[in-house]
């Protein structure tokens, strides 16, 4: 009987035509949302004026579908055993799920005077930005949309640059009608530990983000992992969202829809400084901001953002190091809420519900040149919003699951 | 050493432009802008603008707006400064200098407008 | 724009003496100020640099002060070679600014 099972599991996991993995895994039948609460700064003068702490509120959730598009140029190559395919992008705003609309305004860092200052250095350089930014009448602070911070906006100061730079600045800037990837992931024809593993991301086996074994793609995209997971393994799982690859351990046994899933977490150890967990010295890029690689709990990718100070957190810098959010007020961190986490069905080795949860925070430095940011006193990495991305197996798919799969079982 | 070495002394008809070259060595050249100041015989100093040659970002003073032009050349170290539509009152020594606290100085180089 | 009102405008010194000149700025601007020498035929040379910082090779006779939008050179011990025109320049904003130049004489 098992065996029987097993060869079935392993016929049905395989990422090609005809087979259930691939129904879903070209379209996910899963419906996908993407919170989003933005921290509202409350006093910016302050702020600006005596380098005071940052006081935050969260506003949320605003909430987005996602992830409705199916995969484009999905291309099988038998030699390799591998499938290619780009994952389109695009959200759809609902109201329904929302505590407010697209329009609502929020006082945030000033995104393009924030990432100018730290990617021209030059004082020089920074007293040209200093007699634009005063001319477009920008600050250390602004007011946007909800729609603006996310998708775009013509930014007033870039605008006033005389050579060409691109003036739409926006946190998810641009997102619909484009895609990520090209993927090649392994299809598991040939071998099934392997199915769904990333072979390349656009073209290549390492990202040339980060040094050493941090600049490695491993594991799958975490929509699903080779079958029979066991309690020990360690998930590798590779998200463009952070620019890097991370895993998770198993935490708990949950039940979901009357199926029997492994719950696996993202631990702590995996944002902590080297000197906690040695592998993640690469992970540390620079010594300043980060105190000569002590502190923990954000991740520093510029680099994969063309040199714009960009840093991933967990929401409210969980498991953060106190420097981080000493000079915010107004986060309250808690496990339950801010952590990610994947449902996995173990036989399969599919996600069945999941929890991405991440941060996204800016760097702003002092500048002597730059009037706005003159009378800074220290760095400060700025929260502007967290995310929570989740999906849950439909009614309907976990009834279809428990006949198929889990019921043949027990 | 840090050397700048600016071209010779030009006599010039009014309505017409000059330019002026300044060759850099003795340090990376994209490292540092390059500011150009004049001073007109008997006067005082006087800042033209100055160019940042890894970002090519530019700044003018705005007596010179419109009539300045600064370049630079990464491939020769060579920075330049065009003035156009002269008039007699262009008559000055012109300096190239580099950084922001103009710590080496050009020889300068005598423009003279005269009809 | 930052205006910079330096002065005296001409002063006359003996050897050994002791000479002061003042550069105010119509704003503030922090301690970015700059400090020439300037001898007939030559270009100007930098001496101090923003934060009063005496440059490498400079003697100790020069020296600076002022914060904010008050600024003071000082030549100790004045000797024959210090004759020169002396000019201040802000460096803070854009445009950078001179002072209108001080000529220094020794008697």
């Known amino acids: 009987g098992d065996l029987l099972i097993q060869k079935t599991i392993k016929k049905q996991v395989v990422l090609e035509e005809g087979t259930i993995a691939f129904k879903n895994w070209v379209k996910t039948g899963t419906e996908v949302y993407r919170q989003f609460w933005i921290f509202d700064v409350q006093n910016p003068q302050e702020v600006m004026m005596n380098s005071s702490n940052i006081q935050v509120k969260q506003r949320g959730p605003y909430t987005y579908r996602v992830r409705f598009l199916a995969k484009e140029n999905v291309t099988q190559d038998a030699e390799d055993n591998t499938v290619s395919f780009l994952q389109p992008n695009g959200a759809i705003f609902e109201p329904s799920l929302s505590v407010g609309t697209e329009a609502d305004n929020f006082t945030v860092l000033n995104l393009a005077v924030a990432a100018a200052s730290h990617i021209y250095q030059n004082q020089f350089v920074q007293m040209i930005l200093n007699s634009l930014i005063n001319k477009s009448k920008s600050s250390m602070f602004q007011v946007r949309t909800l729609r603006e911070l996310l998708w775009g906006y013509r930014d007033p100061f870039l605008s006033l640059v005389p050579y060409p730079v691109t003036t739409t600045v926006g946190l998810f800037y641009p997102y619909n009608n484009t895609a990520d990837g090209v993927y090649k992931v392994f299809n598991g024809k040939d071998n099934i530990s392997k199915v769904a593993i990333i072979d390349t991301y656009k073209g290549k086996r390492n990202l040339s983000y980060w040094e050493s074994h941090c600049d490695m793609i491993n594991g799958t995209d975490a929509a699903s992992f080779p079958p029979f997971v066991e309690k020990s393994q360690v998930l590798q799982f590779f998200s463009s969202d952070i620019c890097r690859s991370i895993y998770a351990v198993f935490e708990s046994d949950v039940n979901l829809k009357g199926i029997p899933v492994y719950r696996f977490v993202l631990p702590s150890k995996a944002f902590a400084s080297p000197v906690e967990n040695p592998d993640n010295y690469c992970f540390c890029t620079e010594k300043i901001i980060s105190k000569n690689c002590t502190s923990y709990g954000v991740l520093d990718i510029s680099k994969c953002k063309e040199g714009r100070p960009v840093y991933i957190s967990l929401p409210h810098f969980l498991y953060a190091s106190p420097d981080v959010s000493e000079p915010i007020d107004g986060l309250n961190p808690n496990e339950e809420e801010h952590r990610t986490y994947l449902d996995i069905e173990p036989i399969t080795g599919f996600t069945l519900q999941f929890a991405k949860r991440l941060q996204v925070n800016l760097l702003v430095k002092p500048s002597e040149k730059i009037q706005v940011l003159k009378n800074l006193k220290r760095n400060y990495i700025v929260p502007i919003l967290w995310l929570n991305e989740t999906g849950t197996i439909g009614d309907e798919k976990a009834n279809m699951f428990r006949s198929q799969v889990t019921g043949k079982i027990n | 050493q840090v050397q700048l070495v600016q071209s010779g002394a030009e006599v010039k008809k009014p309505g017409s432009s000059v330019k002026v070259s300044c060759k850099a060595s003795g340090y990376r050249f994209s490292d540092y802008e390059m500011q150009w100041v004049r001073q007109a015989p008997g006067q005082g100093l006087e800042w033209m603008g100055g160019?940042?040659?890894?970002?090519?970002?530019?700044a003018y003073a705005q007596k010179f707006q419109g009539r300045v032009t600064l370049t630079a050349d990464k491939s020769t170290s060579t920075a330049y400064m065009e003035l156009s539509s002269l008039r007699s009152e262009d008559t000055a020594v012109y300096y190239c200098t580099r950084k922001l606290d103009f710590d080496y100085w050009g020889q300068g180089t005598l423009v003279t407008v005269s009809s | 724009e930052t205006t910079v009102t330096q002065s005296p405008a001409f002063m006359s010194a003996t050897t050994g003496d002791k000479v002061t000149i003042s550069c105010i700025t119509s704003?503030?601007?922090?301690?970015?100020m700059n400090w020439y020498q300037q001898k007939p035929g030559e270009p100007p040379k930098l001496l101090i640099s923003?934060?009063?910082t005496l440059r490498p090779g400079v003697p100790s006779r020069f020296s600076s002060s002022g914060y904010g939008t008050d600024f003071t050179f000082t030549i100790n011990n004045i000797e024959s070679e210090d004759a020169a025109y002396y000019y201040c320049?802000?460096?803070?904003?854009?445009?950078?600014?001179f002072g209108q130049g001080t000529k220094l004489e020794i008697k």
């Open positions: 320049l802000q460096s803070d904003n854009l445009p950078l600014t």
């Open positions: 923003e934060g009063n």
């Open positions: 160019i940042d040659p890894e970002t090519g970002g530019i």
């Open positions: 704003t503030d601007i922090d301690d970015d």
